[in-house]
């Protein structure tokens, strides 16, 4: 091999090349000098840097490895951002259908109740959709409002119409009645139960995204140590001292330098990877009543026969009650019972059309595959920053930190580099402040995220099963049916598809949410406009 | 017959804290959702914050989130607000009233005053 | 600035019948219920009307409400000296998670 070239002896293309970093010449020698005041890129000879050169490639060497990081990270970064989005927006279109559906059952099944029932069911959902934001919600405080709200009405409307105005003075003993007689059944704790169990799997399958999020922004917006400059510097810009331009850093030496400036990013790796595991062990149980899609659309079902139970019990629940609130009512009305809120309308809800197979489910798969291929990001940081800046293959010609050598040596690259600053310091030093809270906020998301993921192979949640909850249940095989079974309540092929937007005709007048609520938004419909096609369930 | 009763307003300086009661009666506490809604002096109405009958769920509206604090203690049919870092822009009658989405009873309100 | 758009003054004599509008959008007319509160000078608000069109025990029935698409109303009718007061419409709002207010109307009695 030839020997390295003579320096510039002008330091004209040094000055050249500078000038582009920083305009003006100030700072750059005209010929070589001694460069007793350099702290960086101490010369064995005369050089051509100065100084304040030195602290301009300091700056820009960390200015370069900042983008470097951010470069590397876009890709993941915007998986999950956009993902988070979406799911956050498909959430709220499964609560606005599940509000729609319900508020359809009563307009069908029990037009005397709304609008009422309508305020109550938006409460309901409200809370639903809050629940999901993270908001100190409770589920059973919500689905307790809802049927403490649902029964005076019932009551007065359904069960005893003769009542007249003054009676809605009993409206606060029947709410306690509602409890104390269980007038709607088990309904309530299975829908408790349910909701529950859902909305609980949801909310953190959506914190976790927001927390990958976290993550990579911290990572990303990482200011890197002076020692790490120092070092960068000495690879990236130390070789121009001495008019080497055109040679490039050692890719073993690139690789040691940025496992010394990455050694605390790196130490995420473990956490990263548990996270990531933990997530896909989530999203594998998020199935029957632990997928919200399932449970939520189902629910206008549960609650019809909630009704339905209420109705049977009729007789023997307005004698109880007449006793038990006679001191709200100056006398007893007459139980009225009519018909047609007792039998549901035969025409059946038609179900959506499936054209697509995909879900809420499929998409969430499809997530966590794309999330594996990143399960060794952090750890690979090193590496894929390397190969992304500019290294002599092979290792050979190539700039060691410190000269031009043919070959790269680790050792005596380090053995170089000892009286300069101390790599084994800068690796013991430990994460910075921000990456150890970001270590400490993930430990505790794959701690929820393992409490929360079902044993594999479980097909029904044991307490249910034991309380017969799930009696009503379809199996497991195609044609999956939601919640009750009377007519009137829609079958669900493979769940509801309902990407894009159901195009909904509810003919709901008085209904609150009449037209604006049922007319998909175009932004819904292209937002997934490859999530599967559905057409109206409910004409 | 239904009674709200605020009590705890008072001047108080940008920054300060406070800590609003109102002392329920004649219906079943524990069973309602509970909400403060204030009305600044020559102002309209504006909810601020409400809680579930248990306790267990609490809304807040943007203006006072991480501010204000909502709670209740059912043995005692009290509900509460405690106002920590106020400003000129919290000085206002604070009502408190029965219910969540709609008020049905209302009580007299107390005067909160931010001001140094 | 109010969600929910009230006309700041409505006027008429004894006998007459007043309305006072309140307008809104999809996301709190357009999806719930509407609420109406009285509050008489130096007095607390009052429930008037809630779910659109129901009166609490005691309302008299010269007070009704309706509700169209994103809008509503209050009607008064045999207008009477005790009715001037300050009139609020309300609702929930499904885009701010919360109950929202008219900027209220004032009721003069001539």
């Known amino acids: 091999q030839p020997p390295p070239p003579p320096p510039d002896a002008t330091c004209h293309q040094v000055r050249s090349f500078f000038q582009r970093l920083q305009p003006g010449l100030k700072w750059v020698p005209e010929t070589p000098v001694p460069g007793s005041d350099l702290q960086v890129c101490l010369p064995k000879g005369p050089t051509c840097c100065s100084r304040k050169m030195e602290e301009k490639y300091q700056l820009t060497a960390r200015l370069n490895m900042e983008q470097l990081l951010q470069s590397a990270s876009m890709e993941l970064k915007f998986l999950i951002i956009q993902n988070a989005a979406v799911f956050q927006e498909a959430f709220e279109i499964v609560v606005r259908h599940a509000k729609n559906y319900t508020n359809a059952m009563f307009k069908n099944n029990y037009p005397s109740l709304t609008p009422q029932a309508f305020e109550f069911v938006g409460e309901f959902f409200t809370d639903v959709s809050l629940y999901i934001l993270g908001s100190d919600i409770n589920v059973d405080d919500m689905v307790n409002e809802l049927f403490d709200s649902l029964f005076p009405v019932i009551y007065t409307q359904l069960m005893n119409p003769g009542l007249p105005d003054s009676a809605l003075d009993i409206n606060e003993c029947l709410r306690g009645a509602r409890r104390d007689l269980k007038v709607f059944g088990n309904f309530p704790k299975l829908i408790m139960t349910q909701v529950s169990k859902s909305l609980q799997v949801t909310r953190i399958f959506l914190q976790a995204l927001n927390l990958g999020i976290e993550v990579i922004n911290t990572t990303d917006h990482l200011k890197f140590s002076k020692d790490c400059g120092r070092m960068l510097t000495r690879m990236w810009y130390c070789s121009y001292c001495q008019g080497l331009m055109m040679v490039k850093p050692c890719g073993g030496y690139c690789n040691v330098v940025m496992q010394g400036c990455m050694a605390g990013v790196v130490e995420i790796d473990k956490y990263w990877r548990e996270y990531i595991l933990s997530l896909e062990e989530l999203v594998n149980g998020m199935y029957r009543i632990y997928d919200m899609e399932n449970v939520l659309l189902g629910l206008f079902s549960t609650i019809h026969d909630s009704i339905q139970y209420v109705q049977k019990n009729a007789g023997k629940l307005t004698t109880t009650i007449g006793k038990l609130c006679a001191h709200s009512q100056q006398r007893q009305y007459r139980s009225a019972y009519y018909p047609e809120d007792l039998f549901i309308d035969k025409k059946v809800l038609k179900v959506a059309h499936v054209e697509h197979e995909e879900t809420l489910s499929s998409r969430r798969r499809e997530l966590i595959q794309k999330l594996k291929s990143f399960i060794s990001f952090y750890s690979a940081l090193p590496g894929y920053i390397c190969s992304h800046s500019p290294v002599a293959e092979n290792d050979t010609l190539c700039w060691n930190g410190q000269e031009l050598v043919e070959r790269y040596s680790q050792k005596a690259a380090r053995n170089g580099m000892k009286n300069q600053f101390n790599l084994h310091e800068l690796k013991m030093k430990g994460p910075e402040p921000v990456v150890s809270q970001i270590i400490d906020k993930l430990k505790h998301i794959n701690q929820l995220l393992r409490t929360m993921s079902m044993p594999k192979g479980r097909v029904l949640d044991k307490n249910l099963d034991e309380e017969g909850f799930e009696s009503g249940d379809c199996g497991d095989d195609e044609d999956e049916c939601i919640g009750g079974s009377g007519d009137g309540m829609i079958k669900v092929k493979n769940q509801l598809r309902f990407l894009a937007e159901l195009a909904y005709d509810l003919d709901v007048d008085d209904a609150p949410g009449n037209s604006q609520q049922a007319t998909p938004k175009d932004n819904e419909i292209s937002t997934f406009h490859n999530l599967g096609n559905v057409h109206s369930p409910l004409k | 017959e239904v009674q709200l009763l605020e009590s705890g307003g008072g001047l108080v300086q940008p920054g300060g804290s406070l800590r609003l009661s109102c002392a329920a009666s004649g219906f079943t506490f524990s069973s309602y959702a509970m909400s403060w809604v204030r009305q600044a002096p020559g102002k309209g109405l504006e909810w601020v914050s409400a809680?579930?009958?248990?306790?267990?769920?609490?809304y807040y509206a943007d203006s006072v989130k991480g501010r204000f604090t909502i709670s209740r203690d059912n043995s005692k049919n009290t509900l509460y607000l405690q106002m920590n870092s106020l400003r000129a822009e919290d000085t206002a009658v604070y009502y408190c009233?029965?219910?969540?989405?709609?008020?049905?009873?209302w009580g007299q309100g107390t005067m909160v005053t931010v001001s140094s | 600035q109010s969600v929910l758009t009230q006309p700041p003054s409505a006027s008429g004599t004894p006998g007459q019948r007043v309305t006072i509008s309140c307008s809104g959008g999809s996301s709190d007319i357009g999806s719930n219920t509407v609420n109406w509160y009285q509050q008489l000078p130096g007095t607390a608000p009052k429930l008037l009307i809630y779910y659109n069109n129901q009166r609490p025990s005691g309302v008299p029935d010269r007070f009704s409400g309706s509700k169209s698409g994103t809008s509503a109303s209050l009607a008064i009718s045999g207008l009477q000296s005790e009715d001037e007061a300050d009139y609020y419409c309300a609702t929930w709002d499904d885009r701010m998670y919360s109950p929202v207010f008219g900027g209220g109307t004032k009721l003069t009695v001539l």
């Open positions: 009233a029965k219910g969540k989405r709609y008020f049905d009873y």
């Open positions: 809680i579930s009958g248990s306790g267990g769920s609490t």
